[in-house]
Interface confidence: low
């Protein structure tokens, strides 16, 4: 469930503290409920950048776990189609700390509406 | 030991501040293009221990046309379905990577 996703995000936050990753990532900080799946897709895609740039197996594994888990939950809710939403590349780029904070917020949105 | 000039990436530029070993540099997508979500602009000067030659790692960067500019032309509305985002997992390797 989404609680497991939160715990994996917390682990990623913990693991990156000792690393210098200066990447900026597409971040939706004000998610509209009718575009939450689209926004979640962008977060999951950008998470792979953290995995790639960290070079850390533990981060890679945690990212992979999180993506698989989130995809399982999304697909179990059926094929939801959203239109009129921003593409990932239209979003503002923010630092990793802000990205992860916004990611936690969107997961909480999913928890609150499930 | 230093790295040679980095490879070119389509629709991107790089201004290298340092060619020394372990330097980390970033490509920047050209005007009118954006980094494709999920790709990394990072390249690092690393040493090939077998040959003792330094080289830049290959970035996963893809620069795509800025969707805001593309939208100025008539185009179908952007839609998304819940098909999954697929990670590219590393396979288990028989030896540790440093």
């Amino acid at each position: 469930n989404w609680v497991n996703v939160i715990s994996d995000l917390k682990k990623i936050e913990d693991l990156i503290q000792s690393m210098h990753i200066d990447a900026t990532l597409y971040t939706e900080s004000d998610v509209h409920p009718s575009c939450k799946v689209t926004a979640m897709k962008c977060f999951l895609l950008e998470l792979q950048v953290i995995s790639h740039e960290s070079g850390d197996t533990d981060i890679h594994d945690t990212v992979e776990n999180l993506i698989i888990l989130a995809n399982n939950i999304l697909s179990s809710n059926g094929n939801i189609t959203e239109s009129g939403c921003k593409e990932c590349e239209e979003l503002e780029e923010k630092n990793i700390k802000e990205f992860l904070q916004s990611f936690v917020h969107i997961v909480q949105m999913f928890i609150n509406t499930s | 030991i230093t790295c040679p000039p980095p490879v070119s990436v389509e629709h991107a530029d790089i201004r290298v501040k340092s060619y020394s070993l372990y330097s980390r540099e970033r490509y920047i997508c050209n005007s009118g293009f954006k980094r494709k979500a999920g790709t990394s602009s990072l390249t690092e000067c690393v040493l090939n221990k077998a040959t003792n030659i330094a080289h830049w790692t290959t970035p996963s960067l893809k620069c795509i046309r800025d969707p805001l500019l593309a939208r100025q032309r008539p185009a179908p509305p952007f839609t998304v379905t819940t098909a999954g985002v697929t990670p590219q997992p590393e396979s288990l390797s028989p030896s540790g990577k440093e």
Epitope: K11, L15, S18, T57, H60, I68 | L92
Partner: antibody, heavy 117, light 108 residues
Framework: QVTLKESGPVLVKPTETLTLTCTVS????????VHWIRQPPGKALEWLGV???????DYNPSFMSRLTISKDTSKSQVVLTMTNMDPVDTATYYC???????????WGQGTTVTVSS | EIVLTQSPGTLSLSPGERATLSCRAS???????LAWYQQKPGQAPRLLIY???KLASGIPDRFSGSGSGTDFTLTISRLEPEDFAVYYC?????????FGQGTKVEIK
């Protein structure tokens, strides 16, 4: 070539603190996590905890109050400290390297610890 | 915590026979994060299968893993003399990581 080797006391008295060291080679402790697992005589394997590449730790709740895992990356060593040892803690203690999918692809040969007065 | 129950406790078979070992989880093992290890007397465990069905490096292909959710199986298609050992399953779906109690495969 990846190797892990546990070292420490063979005999520990009840209430004493056990300190075991896992010395590794062939991989970097800043990249790969190391798990500690134990196996009482004739029994199953029991996971104790893990120290991640970045230094954070996860422990089995059953041992959380008396277990500490730390590392000295410069010496390529991981240290397990377990306080208030009891005869039921008599076991072979293993350290093992973490791999993708949270499995242990390389193990030390194990060190047998007996808790007795 | 997730409890893994292995069956049978002991499997008595002859070389050349097929061995089927079961591992049942008390809750669903998400992402099929289940592994199998082989342990011989006086030795450390050796990784055989990871992610339920992927063969670890250097492991002969007579070993295979299958299953998802709560039911997992390790199959040894044709037992070789060196395959007689104890086999453990292990999960990482949630903390703490847990192992099954083991299945001993002995020579009949």
């Amino acid at each position: 070539q990846v190797t892990l080797k546990e070292s420490g006391p063979v005999l520990v008295k009840p209430t004493e603190t056990l300190t075991l060291t896992c010395t590794v080679s062939g991989f970097s402790l800043t990249t790969y996590a190391v798990h500690w697992i134990r196996q009482p005589p004739g029994k199953a394997l029991e996971w104790l905890g893990v120290i991640w590449g970045a230094g954070s730790t996860d422990y089995n709740p059953s041992f959380m109050s008396r277990l500490t895992i730390s590392k000295d990356t410069s010496k390529s060593q991981v240290v397990l400290t377990m306080t208030n040892m009891d005869p039921v803690d008599t076991a072979t203690y293993y350290c093992a390297k973490n791999a993708a999918y949270y499995v242990m692809d390389y193990w030390g040969q194990g060190t047998t610890v007996t808790v007795s007065s | 915590e997730i409890v893994l129950t292995q069956s049978p406790g002991t499997l008595s078979l002859s070389p050349g026979e097929r061995a089927t070992l079961s591992c049942r989880a008390s809750q669903s093992v998400i992402y099929s994060y289940l592994a199998w290890y082989q342990q011989k007397p006086g030795q450390a465990p050796r990784l055989l299968i990871y992610a339920a069905s992927k063969l670890a490096s250097g492991i002969p292909d007579r070993f295979s893993g299958s299953g998802s959710g709560t039911d997992f199986t390790l199959t040894i298609s044709r037992l070789e003399p060196e395959d007689f050992a104890v086999y453990y399953c292990q999960q990482r779906a949630s903390y703490p990581l847990t192992f099954g109690q083991g299945t001993k495969v002995e020579i009949k």
